[in-house]
């Protein structure tokens, strides 16, 4: 029977930066029970708070409600594990609100082919912003990705289409079934999920761009 | 404990390239970004560009942007940074440093640094 | 790009003595300005982030005050294992740029 190994903060995500969640990963537990409590300060404070929510976000986490969460403020947590031989404290982990931010998957995403009389067709796309996020304050840049592929493919193409929320593709097989989907980040945080995927069926007088 | 182990010294001619690599151990390596900056020798610091190991994404500084590339291997925990089209004045020590939590771009832990020389 | 301009480039002084590194950025950041020592042959150590926020386990000696376009790093008392050169850095904007360093020098 031994005091627990060091606990790892290992992840943070906020779906919004108007709540956050952080999960810690527990170190052995040194044959005992053991117990879990994060504590944390915002920078320039010396009080420390405990965790407001254990509940919310599942086994080993922290959940930051709206009144617990400021933006634009460093916040430095660590886990303390105790059990009855002794305890021991994760690092310390910084965390920026601003900087963890996980959106939803874009919205609304339609896929048409145009087929111009003075141009090559080309597949034209388009969608909305998650609703969550409020990008008329200018605290957030979403840039958006897109893939595809032919139903049958294993392989993804995948296309960057930085902060547009429209694209075109023109180099597509025609006659092929495609499933489009788009996903997007804030520029300093994570990739949302993809967004459900979208079917269209390219004509078979799609004609290929050279 | 938190540590960062670099590639050894490199000789290179002008020219060539350079892949200099960063071993991550004693965190989970896609909780942070990690940074390139190299100092030429008696100089000061210059930042590269940073990388988020968890998705690839990368930032660089526009100066390197067509010669430099950062990479990473999940599998192993390691960073890379990749210098093309080596010239004299390559010749620096390239350090990989860790983002200091989950927010802006200070350093909390740097490798040990490489020593690059680029010379004829 | 936002340069840091450092003063002085090196500054001569004695165990116990209070120095003062000023750190002045091209245009507006914030508090978002570090500040490392370096030693010779060693990479750069953390100090200060967030312009006055010490990071863990750093001496209480070494502060910072500023914000905006000028920032200064105050060693209140010098002790031996301080000899070294200051480095400030800037993460308000991209690319995240450098003070040209302070030595700071035993007199």
């Known amino acids: 029977q031994l005091p627990p190994g060091k606990p790892e903060i290992f992840k943070c995500r906020s779906p919004n930066k108007e709540t956050f969640t952080c999960w810690w990963r527990p170190g052995t537990d040194g044959g005992l029970p053991t117990n879990y409590s994060l504590t944390y300060h915002r920078e320039g404070e010396t009080l420390m708070h405990e965790c407001p929510d254990y509940i919310t976000g599942g086994p080993n986490s922290c959940h930051f409600g709206k009144q617990y969460t400021s933006m634009w403020r460093t916040y430095v947590m660590m886990v303390n594990a105790t059990n009855q031989m002794g305890s021991s404290f994760s690092d310390e982990l910084y965390v920026d609100v601003t900087y963890i931010v996980q959106p939803d998957p874009p919205l609304e995403l339609t896929v048409e082919v145009k087929q111009p009389e003075d141009r090559k067709p080309y597949l034209w796309m388009k969608w909305s912003p998650p609703t969550l996020i409020d990008l008329k304050t200018g605290w957030f840049t979403l840039l958006y990705e897109i893939r595809l592929k032919p139903e049958k493919a294993a392989e993804w193409e995948t296309h960057f289409a930085g902060q547009q929320t429209e694209f075109k593709i023109l180099s597509l097989h025609p006659g092929q079934k495609y499933l489009v989907q788009v996903r997007c980040k804030p520029d300093h945080g994570y990739w949302s999920a993809w967004s459900p995927a979208t079917f269209i069926q390219i004509p078979s007088d799609f004609i290929m761009n050279d | 404990e938190v540590q960062l182990v670099q590639s050894g010294a490199e000789v290179k001619k002008p020219g060539s390239s350079v892949k200099v690599s960063c071993k991550a151990s004693?965190?989970?390596?896609?909780?942070?970004?990690m940074h390139w900056v190299r100092q030429a020798p008696g100089q000061g610091l210059e930042w590269i560009g940073e990388i988020d190991p968890s998705d690839s994404y990368s930032n660089y500084n526009q100066k390197f942007k067509d010669r430099a590339t950062l990479t990473v291997d999940k599998s192993t925990s390691t960073a890379y940074m990749e210098l093309s089209s080596l010239r004299s004045e390559d010749t620096a020590v390239y350090y990989c440093?860790?983002?200091?939590?989950?927010?802006?771009?200070?350093?909390?832990?740097w490798g040990q640094g490489t020593l690059v020389t680029v010379s004829s | 790009d936002i340069q840091m301009t450092q003063s002085p480039s090196s500054v001569s002084a004695s165990v116990g003595d209070r120095v003062t590194i000023t750190c002045k950025a091209s245009q507006y950041v914030g508090t978002a300005v570090a500040w490392y020592q370096q030693k010779p042959g060693k990479s750069p150590k953390l100090l200060i982030y967030?312009?006055?926020n010490r990071y863990t386990g750093v001496p209480s000696r070494f502060s910072d005050s500023g914000s905006g376009t000028d920032f200064t790093l105050t060693i209140s008392s010098l002790q031996p294992e301080d000899f070294a050169t200051y480095f400030c850095q800037q993460y308000s904007s991209y690319p995240w740029t450098f003070g040209g360093g302070t030595k700071v020098e035993i007199k």
């Open positions: 440093a860790r983002n200091g939590g989950l927010g802006p771009a200070w350093f909390s832990y």
């Open positions: 967030s312009a006055s």
């Open positions: 004693g965190y989970t390596f896609t909780t942070y970004w």
